[in-house]
């Protein structure tokens, strides 16, 4: 560690005095101190001499000697006071810049340590400090404003009591800069705009930041618009607002509008699209197929997308039949607005009953007129099967009726023994009926088909089974001939004699 001579922490001299500061180290040494006049530097190997033969108040400050070659980076310091009765302060800098919440050192150095008891910090014109200003004083360094705030950006003077009167330093301007987290925050309202030619429109671009130094502009299709700017300050943020007012829009006003704001941290931009139309419009669409098939007992949501300008004046869901005159419950209808001009309307149909199949229409109205979108809802049913023994044209015939939706396929099985359902091991014969006769096929109803199996002689120790299936499920009916007559077995049901 270097050594300074004189070996005292502080040295007090009068103006005009000769001061010699000598530093000795193991290797070469360097002096560092406040920039001030009249010093002469003389270096000789491992020692360096700093001297003046005419000390002034401006030489007041801390002089530090370092040994650049020392790996431990040791240093020695001495503080010099040049006590000038007319100049109690040596100001090292007239402008101090810090960020908010940093400590701000106002470098007014006291030229006479005796004056320390009577020092104070004031604002220019002798005004007291702002409320909640937390500061401390060091005669070697000056006043420190702790955790400086933006509003403490002021001009300050250091005051010392000399002979009963206050003597001020020259001013020190403190600039406390806001810590800017990023580019200004932006809003562009509306996010989308549609107007009929001749109508009025307004687009508002606003930007805000904790710091006043930022720019904002509005551009239309890459052309910067000249709009007067309104400025405001609230919630500790500066706000700049650009409002574009169009009294009568035309097609040339349409297009992309961008709100752009920038500061030292960068740039933010947000865009919107302005559409100018000739007249009112109302478009209905659905992402779903308009023809819907759902299994009975399940639920369905019908969704309609509406694009409209001007806004809707009315809308509703209507059941058009054919089964009943019931109407959808209002509580099952739901409307959500995606944005200003697009809406989604949903009709919830939970646990569908047979009587709820049919046509559902969504109707909407705006100044452009009425529009409707109709869904056709068909219910799917698993097949229901029944078999009877009859004579047709003198021949014994098993008649199987199957009812369901979609149209069921029919298969006949003949198996040994009496059983409710033929299993693989018992099957003697299988007949597929590729074209059963369609007995009824009305929209939104079940399809009923009939299949005939001509049997010359009924084998008494056998079972005849009619099976029907579709995409929903399957059904079957077992027919067991017995000596007393023919018996039929619906699955898991009682025997009966036709």
């Amino acid at each position: 560690i270097p050594v300074i001579e004189p070996s005292v922490p502080e040295l007090v001299v009068k103006p005009g005095a000769t001061v010699t500061l000598r530093c000795v180290g193991n290797g070469s040494v360097e002096w560092d101190g406040p920039p001030s006049p009249h010093w002469t530097l003389y270096s000789d190997g491992s020692s360096s001499i700093l001297s003046t033969n005419n000390a002034t108040f401006q030489n007041t400050g801390t002089y530090r000697c370092t040994e650049p070659g020392d790996p431990l980076g040791g240093s020695a310091a001495i503080h010099l006071y040049v006590k000038d009765p007319a100049r109690p302060w040596n100001v090292l800098a007239q402008e101090v810049v810090v960020f908010e919440d940093q400590d701000a050192l106002l470098p007014c150095l006291l030229t006479d340590p005796v004056l320390e008891a009577g020092v104070s910090l004031v604002r220019v014109r002798g005004r007291p400090l702002m409320r909640h200003t937390n500061y401390s004083f060091s005669p070697w360094h000056g006043f420190t404003i702790h955790r400086a705030k933006f509003i403490q950006s002021q001009d300050y003077q250091c005051s010392a009591l000399m002979g009963g009167r206050k003597v001020m330093s020259i001013s020190i301007r403190l600039k406390v800069q806001k810590v800017i987290p990023g580019p200004p925050a932006l809003t562009l309202v509306p996010a989308e705009l549609v107007r009929i030619r001749g109508e009025a429109a307004q687009i508002v671009c606003s930007a805000s930041s904790v710091d006043v130094n930022f720019d904002v502009f509005l551009q239309h299709n890459n052309t910067k618009l000249a709009i007067p700017q309104q400025s405001d300050f609230h919630n500790n943020r500066y706000q700049k607002v650009l409002t574009l007012n169009l009294d009568q829009v035309d097609f040339q006003h349409a297009g992309n509008y961008s709100c752009v704001a920038s500061n030292v941290q960068g740039k933010h931009s947000t865009s919107m699209f302005f559409r100018v139309v000739e007249s009112a419009y109302l478009n209905l669409s659905s992402e779903q197929n308009l023809i819907q098939e759902v299994t009975v007992g399940e639920g369905l949501n019908l969704k309609v997308m509406v694009e409209a300008y001007p806004g809707l004046q009315g809308f509703n869901w209507t059941y058009l039949g054919p089964f009943s005159d019931h109407q959808p419950e209002p509580k099952l209808a739901n409307a959500t607005t995606k944005d200003t001009y697009r809406h989604t309307f949903t009709l919830s149909l939970p646990r569908l009953k047979p009587s709820e199949a049919g046509r559902y229409s969504f109707l909407a109205r705006n100044p452009g007129g009425w529009r409707a979108l109709t869904f056709e809802l068909t219910l799917r049913y698993p097949p229901e099967v029944s078999v009877i023994w009859t004579f047709i044209n003198g021949s014994g015939t098993l008649l199987c009726a199957a009812s369901g939706y979609p149209q069921p396929n029919v298969t006949w099985l003949q198996c040994s023994g009496h059983t409710d359902r033929c299993d693989e091991a018992q099957v003697l014969q299988v007949w597929d009926d590729p074209y059963p006769e369609v007995l009824s096929q009305e929209p939104f109803h079940k399809v009923t088909v009939q299949s005939l199996l001509t049997v010359e002689t009924l084998e008494h120790n056998q079972t005849y089974e009619c099976r029907a299936h579709n995409s929903v499920g399957s059904g079957s009916w077992a027919f067991i001939p017995i000596s007393a007559g023919a018996h039929t077995h619906p699955p898991d049901e009682f025997l009966f004699t036709p």
Partner: antibody, heavy 117, light 111 residues
Framework: EVQLVESGGGLVQPGGSLRLSCAAS????????MHWVRQATGKGLEWVSG???????YYPGSVKGRFNISRENAKNSLYLQMNSLRAGDTAVYYC???????????WGQGTLVTVSS | EIVLTQSPGTLSLSPGERATLSCRAS??????????LAWYQQKPGQAPRLLIY???STATGIPDRFSGSGSGTDFTLTISRLEPEDFAVYYC?????????FGQGTRLEIK
């Protein structure tokens, strides 16, 4: 947008009193020193009083002891209580905000005080 | 108190010309390199408007034809090229020591 709106002016007899108000908006009122400046018809500007953020008050010799400046930060309001009014106090009174180191950066539109018998 | 003296009392110029207004202080209104002098413009029936602060800094929204200079006791307001709307009364003000004082004003009129 910074706005200062004065009110309370009017006709008053010599020796009478009047209280002027200044409503501030668009900035953090409590963070700024505020002032009153007056201007007699056809004359120049004259600083009348000032108040700091800490409530410290300042007056020129011409009004000291007669005028009292005050502020109510919660209401964003500045006041000037004028007592023992004289004919020489007749003027338009302006409320002004002092920037950090900018001088008086915003002014109100003024309120007329007439002292006459 | 610091007395500010403006000159000339009245200045008659034509649009497009250069205007130079002077303000002299009875004692220094500077502190180091910081000067506490402002210039204001006032039109009939209106409040004063800040043009220049700190002797040479232009206030927000003021056209760059307005400029200020000077330090210590001598200060100048220059309008590089007069526009019709610039004809008004101009005041200097010192705000570095109490009481704050204004100059008596310079009337800038159309020739």
């Amino acid at each position: 947008e910074v706005q200062l709106v004065e009110s309370g002016g009017g006709l008053v007899q010599p020796g009478g009193s009047l209280r002027l108000s200044c409503a501030a908006s668009g900035f953090t009122f409590s963070s700024y020193d505020m002032h009153w400046v007056r201007q007699a018809t056809g004359k120049g500007l004259e600083w009348v009083s000032g108040i700091g953020t800490a409530g410290d008050t300042y007056y020129p010799g011409s009004v000291k002891g007669r005028f009292n400046i005050s502020r109510e930060n919660a209401k964003n309001s500045l006041y000037l209580q004028m007592n023992s009014l004289r004919a020489g106090d007749t003027a338009v009174y302006y409320c002004a905000r002092e920037g950090s180191w900018y001088g008086f950066d915003y002014w109100g539109q003024g309120t007329l005080v007439t002292v006459s018998s | 108190e610091i007395v500010l003296t403006q000159s000339p009392g009245t200045l008659s110029l034509s649009p497009g010309e250069r205007a130079t207004l002077s303000c002299r202080a009875s004692q220094s209104v500077s502190s180091g390199y910081l000067a506490y002098l402002a210039w204001y413009q006032q039109k009939p029936g209106q409040a004063p408007r800040l043009l220049i602060y700190g002797a040479s800094s232009t206030a927000t929204g003021i056209p760059d034809r307005f400029s200020g200079s000077g330090s210590g006791t001598d200060f100048t307001l220059t309008i590089s090229r007069l526009e019709p709307e610039d004809f008004a009364v101009y005041y200097c003000q010192q705000y570095g020591s109490s009481p704050i004082t204004f100059g008596q004003g310079t009337r800038l009129e159309i020739k």
